[in-house]
């Protein structure tokens, strides 16, 4: 399980309308459920139940976003509509370029994501926990526009966005 180097770029605006970017680095792990490759896109916070909904199935999708899902304690959702892997698959089907799971409350999800899948997703599925997860969720909960950049080697300086 390789280390995933995640950079989160936060867009902050000044009263004049100019935008400044703030970059935070954190690390996670690439799971076996997905591919070990770089990805980048706007962070879209997804509630685990938001991925249960089927009524978007016929949509044309928007692509190039990174889904961030904070998994709840298994006791709070004893009969989930989809497995963790199923949720990752649903997000990628809907256009996600990568999915990041915060597994802090549900560490068993790590095993589920790392079970050798015969048909892994073609996009990265990353999990974060502990201090890195707190850092990520603090940014996500700020209700700001943010972009995540996932790399499988430490980011070089100065940071540059790369192609989707």
């Amino acid at each position: 399980k390789e280390t995933a180097f995640v950079e989160v770029v936060l867009f902050e605006s000044s009263p004049s309308g100019d935008y400044t970017t703030y970059t935070t680095g954190l690390t996670g792990r690439f799971s076996r459920a997905g591919a070990t490759l770089s990805a980048e896109g706007e962070i879209v916070q997804m509630h685990p139940l938001g991925l249960c909904n089927n009524n978007d199935e016929e949509d044309l999708y928007e692509y190039g976003w990174v889904g961030v899902v904070k998994l709840e304690q298994p006791e709070l959702d004893p009969k989930p509509c989809l497995t963790v892997l199923g949720k990752a698959k649903r997000a990628v089907q809907r256009g996600a370029t990568a999915v990041i799971f915060d597994v802090s409350e549900n560490p068993e999800a790590i095993d589920q994501l790392n079970q050798g899948s015969e048909d892994p997703l073609k996009r990265p599925v990353v999990y974060v926990k502990g201090a890195d997860a707190i850092k990520l969720m603090n940014i996500v909960n700020k209700q700001k526009v943010a972009r995540a950049r996932i790399q499988h080697r430490p980011p070089r300086q100065p940071t540059e966005y790369f192609d989707m």
Partner: antibody, heavy 116, light 107 residues
């Protein structure tokens, strides 16, 4: 079927305010980011504002501090509040679904005319 | 703001002809550029996202390429329904900016 329907446009005087609505149906509104884009009839497109599914927002410099984008996920509705309107704000205002970019679904637009 | 310069502003072409429209950006935006088509009286339609990806349902005669800060939309063989206005949009860095547009007309 995904549908986006704008309303609330009309004729106002410079300095006045207006609140536009975009009613969404056919998809899980709370899962998606939404944009407002405007167009002077017969002219080019002008990106106005964006709101993430969780409420973060971005604005064009020309409208920052005067326009406010918001959403009510319970009502499946996107809003754009326009204040201190200027004649150059006259345009058709479209809402569009999408994350960092306006995607395949756009509304037909509502016309805002600012004139004394 | 990132400047987006679109050319030409208008274009006369014949049916079956190959058509190319260009957008140049003032700074590097990698592949964060989309192309939209707008027919008279209609809302814009997304053709190409992230510079080269064809939106579902869009005919394969449309394609996008880029090199550095130069982006092109190509229609390999012009059809009557392609007569419209075309716009590019950079969504790399806010505030997002559209090109001024290209009016494509029949020769």
């Amino acid at each position: 079927e995904v549908q986006l329907v704008e309303s609330g446009g009309g004729l106002v005087q410079p300095g006045e305010s207006l609140k536009l609505s975009c009613s969404a149906s056919g998809f899980t509104f709370s899962n998606y980011g939404m944009h407002w884009i405007r167009q002077v009839p017969g002219k080019g497109l002008d990106w106005v504002a964006y709101i993430t599914n969780s409420g973060g927002s971005l604005y064009a410099a020309a409208v920052k501090g005067r326009f406010t984008i918001s959403r009510d996920n319970a009502k499946n509705t996107l809003y754009l509040e326009l204040t201190s309107l200027k004649s150059e704000d006259t345009a058709i205002y479209h809402c569009a679904r999408g994350y960092s970019y306006p995607g395949p679904y756009w509304g037909r637009g509502t016309l805002v005319t600012v004139s004394s | 703001d990132i400047q987006v310069t679109q050319s030409p502003s208008s274009l006369l072409a014949s049916l079956g002809e190959r058509v190319t429209i260009t957008c140049q950006t003032g700074q590097s935006i990698n592949n964060y550029l989309n192309w939209y088509q707008q027919r008279p009286g209609q809302a814009p339609l997304l053709l190409i996202y992230f510079a080269t990806s064809l939106q579902t349902g869009v005919p394969s005669r449309f394609s996008g390429q880029y090199s550095g800060r130069s982006f092109t939309l190509t229609i390999t063989s012009l059809e009557p329904e392609d007569i419209a206005n075309y716009f590019c949009l950079q969504h790399y860095s806010p505030p997002y900016t559209f090109g001024a547009g290209t009016k494509l007309e029949l020769r």
